[in-house]
């Protein structure tokens, strides 16, 4: 239910004995209040009363879920992967119906040899995980299979996986050109038909920290941004200190509103502070400006 909350004034005392006066509720924002039984908990912004306190939804916190956090946890996956759907034609094995049955001795042996061969082919690719045969069909043996690639998540993971898929293409093209039958005989572990090598499809893990950050920031999505530290993405508002995008409020406190980050300037015993960044000090006694 919607409720009207009386607006109170909060006075914050700084370490030097100064006060910040700010309305604790943004009166331009409709406030939803969670009521459980007779207990009007005043949990705002979708928060709910658990019997003891307000349980707030991201990106809110505080006694009544009225404040916006400065940073939101985003968790990129530890690893990211790519799957390449490939087809090669093996000429050193003749197709038999038993190969269609994945539990047959024929399939198991073919799978073992094919896996060994592909492990050799892709041995120089650090992202290579393995192969998975999806289908075998007639035409000597047409092998439909997936090549699986994996790498640690970094901001450049897409480039790393794209490069790895290119190397896979080069290596499979090379081996299927070189390892061919001579006089109806194969001297390699497996022999191939050069023209039967095709890359059908490539699927790369999609992870966008910016998108996750925007989604979790909800109506504050335009004011939260992603910055990296040690290759790890952080979803921050300008009120979070220590980042390039951090807002310097000088003699004030940074607070998020639906219009973005703003500085709430302090008043000390000796000065009034004003300006967008609270950097304009006016001495109370002499009305003198310091910049």
């Amino acid at each position: 239910p919607l409720a009207t909350i009386p607006v109170s004034t909060t006075s914050l005392t700084s370490s030097e004995g100064s006060t910040i006066s700010t309305p604790s509720v943004d009166i331009s924002t409709p406030v939803t209040t969670s009521i459980v039984g007779d207990q009007c908990s005043r949990c705002k912004n979708g928060g709910f009363w658990d019997g003891l306190k307000c349980q707030c939804l991201t990106p809110y916190y505080g006694e009544s879920c009225e404040e916006v956090v400065n940073s939101i946890d985003i968790a990129p996956p530890e690893t990211v992967s790519a799957q390449m759907e490939l087809t090669v034609t093996v000429t050193s094995v003749k197709f038999t119906d038993e190969l269609k049955n994945h539990s047959s001795q024929e399939f198991r042996e073919f799978n073992k040899t094919f896996t060994e061969q592909m492990n050799i082919v892709y041995s120089g690719i650090p992202e290579y995980v393995g192969v998975n045969i999806t289908n075998l069909r007639l035409g000597s043996v047409v092998v439909e299979h997936d090549v699986l690639l994996r790498t640690k998540y970094t901001p450049e993971y897409k480039t790393a996986l794209d490069n790895a898929t290119e190397v896979v293409k080069q290596k499979i093209t090379k081996v299927t050109t070189e390892q061919i039958m001579t006089n109806d005989n194969c001297s390699a572990l497996m022999c191939f038909n050069t023209t039967g090598t095709q890359v059908q499809n490539i699927t790369v893990t999609q992870y966008d920290p910016v998108e996750e950050c925007r989604q979790k920031a909800e109506e504050y999505e335009d004011y939260f941004l992603v910055e990296y530290r040690d290759q790890k993405p952080y979803c921050i508002s300008p009120c979070e200190s220590g980042f390039n995008a951090s807002k310097n409020c000088n003699h004030g406190k940074c607070q998020m509103s639906q219009n973005g980050a703003r500085c709430l300037c302090v008043t000390t015993e000796t000065h009034w502070y004003s300006g967008e960044d609270c950097n304009q000090g006016t001495q109370k006694s002499h009305h003198h400006h310091h910049h």
Partner: nanobody, 123 residues
């Protein structure tokens, strides 16, 4: 588990003949392939001959016209008839089997192996 046992090796003079046999524990490979490999002292194992269930046979260039591979499915046996033997044919001979209809004389393509039998060609 599949068992393969090669036999028939021995000492023979250059130009002589020998017949090697390989007994399989069952007829598992009657629909796949069987082959002979050899390994001379200090050298890598190399393919000699191959026979598949579809009747196809293949030989290493060094033995073509001198060696003949054959199979008796009723007896679960593989044979290698070796004629016009030379000193360079001296090696331990192994039989190998596969469930696949193979066209490969690379030892790595074969998963089932028998014990070897020694063939020495010397005057």
């Amino acid at each position: 588990d599949v068992q393969l046992q090669a036999s028939g090796g021995g000492l023979v003079q250059p130009g002589g003949s020998l017949r090697l046999s390989c007994a399989a524990s069952d007829n598992t490979f009657s629909r796949g392939s069987m082959s002979w490999f050899r390994q001379a002292p200090g050298k890598e194992r190399e393919g000699v001959a191959i026979i598949s269930s579809d009747g196809w046979t293949g030989y290493a260039d060094s033995v073509k016209g001198r060696f003949t591979i054959s199979q008796d499915n009723a007896k679960n046996s593989l044979y290698l008839q070796m004629n016009s033997l030379r000193a360079e044919d001296t090696a331990v001979y192994y039989c190998a089997a596969s469930f696949l209809v193979l066209r490969a004389l690379n030892p790595k393509a074969w998963h089932y192996w028998g014990q070897g039998t020694m063939v020495t060609v010397s005057s």
